[in-house]
């Protein structure tokens, strides 16, 4: 088979011959160096994950809970390309699983014990098992047979499809269980119907499904969705409260050496040439010898899933959760309030050691992960095998882009009530050497320039959000001659100027010299000729203030600030010469860990914080000798965020807007598998 | 100058104990939490158990009720009591002291510890 083939999975005769017709109209309308399609033949869906897995094969179109199977070991299949619906324009690729209430009923999600529930068929994705999943551990025991479980859990339900006379609690609300349209309450508008009637409770049903029933807006004010936090909200909010977001239909590859470019190739050619109303002898979006072979009858096109996004990214930690416990019938020994210890992702191996060190004497409440970049522990907190980090602003924008959530500040400032006050932020600055006088923020071009690392605040957003309004392209590399930003690509001249060894050269972790607000400044000593950090970094790194011996000599009056105005100050003048005001770092978290890390974080600072005086022999949290592990070493408390408690709303208006901006400069792969999750 | 000097490992069969040693000088010991690490061949050093200046104790899961934590403060001297031994706690075991600083790469020579089945 020729290096460029991709072997197709069919999973019946219908879709074999539909899969032979696929690659006879390939072959005509692409060039002979171009992909090519062959068909493999396989009895199931199973046995077509297995042979792709064993390179008997290469892609299969699978819907979400077999790309699950799929992404299990040995498997280990990833997500390649997704069929989209809807319009090229507003594309929908995945659709949201929601639990439906009426409006005055007044109950919340952790409350459905004894309600009356309308489902829209037994093992069904959406009207049952992300439901059932999710509420698994709160089943009563024994929790096999599932069915008896759910049976014993809600005062009466209809499941259409279940065994009426072996579980009869099931189809109470619908005499008989019916598997088909014939059972009034089937499906998604029946279980819908069967909340609209009042048989049930609450209906457990896609987002759609409300707007396909009430074309009527003052019709759908009268219902409500339950959010996995215990609140509710309005039913078009149904981004921010669902049970989960699950991908409709996907072709999945090996994850190393998968030929992911080879298939995006070939479908993107192929919905060229045989997409929706592009040919008449063959098209990929229609079944005429059955329904949805090969691809779902209803697609409208595909879109390329983004390289960084694995199984666990693209199904959703609710998803995963749900499908997980339905599976694998684990849960906690007993149900507790009590909080399990918070899991802290550390970068590198020198935050692991300090995070060793706060876990033993935290006493059982922190655990330690550990990850080589910020990317890597955001995507592990996403996916639950790492609870909690603190971030600089320009990452806590990744992290909401990515689900996550702001729970307490970094507070910089000294105060009576530090915790119950969050500070407005800290000022983003361009420093340059006194000696270099002639040096302006109107003449960087050319010059060598030091950064904290790409996607930060004062290192990256602030200062190259500001340079591209001037120069309009995203080429700083151009810009500037040389440079230390780690996290740029390892040709880039923007790690030319980095000090780390090997493999270490310009990575955004302190494995790299120049990386962070210190390594940033010891750059500009070093080798640079402005760098881009706090208000506080030379302060704290000159005056013997930094013992290290690049560092112990230095004096403040040999640097100075440069002002957007094209003069410079005193680096005490910040306030009047600075680029912008920066969102203080702040602690993230999944949504469903919000109050665990909020209450257990309290706890520690008020054991380890700034009230520690003698930190050479008690443990500090808030301290690493200059070195910024975990926290910003000059923070004083983390702080309540009251209200602020989105990310936009904890970025604000203004900095969301900038780094927007900057999107279109990001080499962040993980914003790119964010944002396909939620454009 | 810090200098943490480890002893005890050996090559012992699957099922048996060792006792580890480590000597403390140049720290005031007392008032210090230590740890012991291990380091397997092509792998990241992990904590395998750490305590605090109270005596209180943690361990990884891997480890938990098979190996003892210790200190004796009078002789500034850690120690890891481990029994149970299993082939794959072969490592090179080192002790640290966190008051060093967490950014500084300095470990010592740690002390071989061969499992066999």
């Known amino acids: 088979v020729p290096d460029k083939t991709v072997r197709w999975c069919a999973v019946s005769e219908h879709e074999a011959t539909k899969c032979q017709s696929f690659r006879d109209h390939m072959k005509s309308v692409i060039p002979s160096d171009g992909p090519s399609v062959a068909c493999v033949k396989k009895a199931s869906y199973l046995d077509c994950i297995r042979a792709i897995a064993a390179n008997e094969a290469d892609a299969v179109t699978l819907d979400a809970g077999l790309v699950y199977d799929a992404y299990l070991a040995p498997n280990n299949l990833k997500p390649v390309v997704a069929e989209f619906y809807g319009s090229k324009e507003d594309p929908q690729t995945f659709y949201y699983a929601v639990a439906v209430v009426k409006k005055d009923s007044g109950f919340q999600m952790n409350q459905l014990r004894g309600k009356k529930s309308c489902h829209t068929g037994l093992g069904r994705s959406a009207g049952w098992n992300i439901p059932i999943g999710l509420l698994y551990c709160d089943l009563p025991e024994p929790r096999k047979p599932l069915e008896k479980a759910v049976a014993n859990f809600f005062s009466g339900s209809c499941a259409p499809c279940a065994d009426g006379t072996d579980f009869p609690q099931l189809c109470q609300l619908c005499p008989g269980c019916g598997c088909s349209t014939l059972n009034q309450y089937f499906g998604y508008s029946g279980a819908f119907k069967c909340l609209k009637d009042g048989a049930g409770d609450v209906a457990f049903v896609k987002h759609s499904t409300i707007f396909e029933n009430l074309a009527n807006k003052a019709d759908r004010d009268q219902y409500e969705l339950l959010c996995l936090d215990n609140t509710r909200k309005p039913v078009d909010e149904y981004k921010d409260c669902h049970l989960a977001q699950v991908p409709s239909h996907t072709v999945v590859a090996r994850s190393m050496g998968g030929k992911e470019d080879l298939i995006w190739e070939l479908l993107n050619q192929a919905q060229e040439h045989f997409g929706k109303d592009k040919s008449k002898e063959f098209q990929l979006f229609s079944s005429p010898h059955g329904k949805d072979l090969l691809f779902k009858d209803s697609a409208h096109g595909f879109l390329k899933v983004p390289p960084r996004m694995d199984a666990k990214m693209y199904l959703g930690y609710e998803y995963v959760t749900a499908i997980r416990n339905l599976r694998e019938g684990t849960c906690p020994e007993a149900p507790t309030d009590e909080c399990k210890p918070v899991k802290w992702c550390a970068l590198s191996h020198h935050e692991r050691l300090k995070c060793d060190e706060w876990s033993v004497n935290s006493v059982g409440k922190i655990e330690c992960v550990s990850a080589e970049t910020t990317e890597d522990c955001i995507a592990k907190i996403m996916n639950g095998e790492a609870d909690a980090m603190s971030l600089d602003g320009g990452f806590v924008y990744i992290a909401g882009k990515c689900g996550l959530v702001p729970v307490l500040a970094e507070n910089y400032n000294k105060s009576d009530n530090c915790e119950d006050t969050p500070e407005a932020g800290y000022f983003a600055i361009a420093v340059v050497k006194k000696s270099a006088s002639d040096l302006t923020w109107d003449n960087l071009k050319g010059k060598k320039s030091c950064h904290t690392a790409v996607g930060r605040t004062a290192g990256w957003n602030i200062p190259m959000g500001l340079l591209y309004n001037k120069i309009n392209h995203c080429r700083f590399d151009e810009f500037f001659s040389e440079g230390c930003a780690p996290g740029s690509k390892k040709d880039s001249s923007l790690c030319k100027l980095c000090m780390g060894s090997g493999l270490n050269l310009c990575e955004p972790n302190n494995k790299e010299g120049y990386y962070g607000y210190t390594g940033a400044f010891r750059c500009l000593v070093e080798k640079g000729d402005v760098a881009f950090v706090k208000h506080q970094t030379v302060p704290q790194n000159t005056g013997g203030k930094n013992p290290d011996p690049w560092a112990k000599n230095l004096n403040e009056k040999d640097y100075e600030l440069l002002c957007l105005d094209g003069t410079r100050k005193p680096v005490e003048e910040y306030a009047n010469c600075h680029l912008a005001r920066a969102p203080n770092h702040a602690v993230v978290t999944r949504k469903d860990k919000e109050a665990c890390v909020h209450k257990i974080l309290r706890q520690q600072q008020h054991l380890f914080g700034s009230n520690v005086t003698d930190c050479s022999g008690n443990f500090c949290l808030f301290r690493s000798e200059t070195k910024d592990l975990l926290f910003r070493d000059d923070t004083v408390c983390l702080a309540k965020l009251h209200d602020r408690n989105t990310y936009e709303k904890y970025l604000g208006e203004e900095y969301v807007k900038a780094v927007g901006n900057l999107r279109k400069c990001s080499t962040s792969s993980l914003l790119e598998a964010c944002t396909f999750r939620r454009p | 100058q810090v200098q943490l000097v480890e002893s005890g490992g050996g090559l012992v069969q699957s099922g048996g104990s060792l006792r580890l040693s480590c000597a403390a000088s140049?720290?005031?010991?007392?008032?210090?939490?230590m740890a012991w690490y291990r380091q397997a061949p092509g792998q990241q050093r992990e904590l395998v158990a750490g305590?605090?200046?109270?005596?209180?104790?943690k361990y990884a899961d891997s480890v938990k009720g098979r190996f003892t934590i210790s200190r004796d403060n009078a002789k500034n001297t850690l120690y890891l009591q481990m029994n149970s031994l299993k082939p794959e706690d072969t490592a090179v075991y080192y002790c640290?002291?966190?008051?060093?600083?967490?950014?500084?790469?300095?470990w010592g020579q740690g002390t071989q510890v061969t499992v066999s089945s």
């Open positions: 140049g720290t005031i010991f007392a008032i210090n939490t």
């Open positions: 640290t002291d966190y008051s060093r600083g967490y950014y500084q790469d300095y």
């Open positions: 305590i605090t200046r109270g005596g209180s104790t």
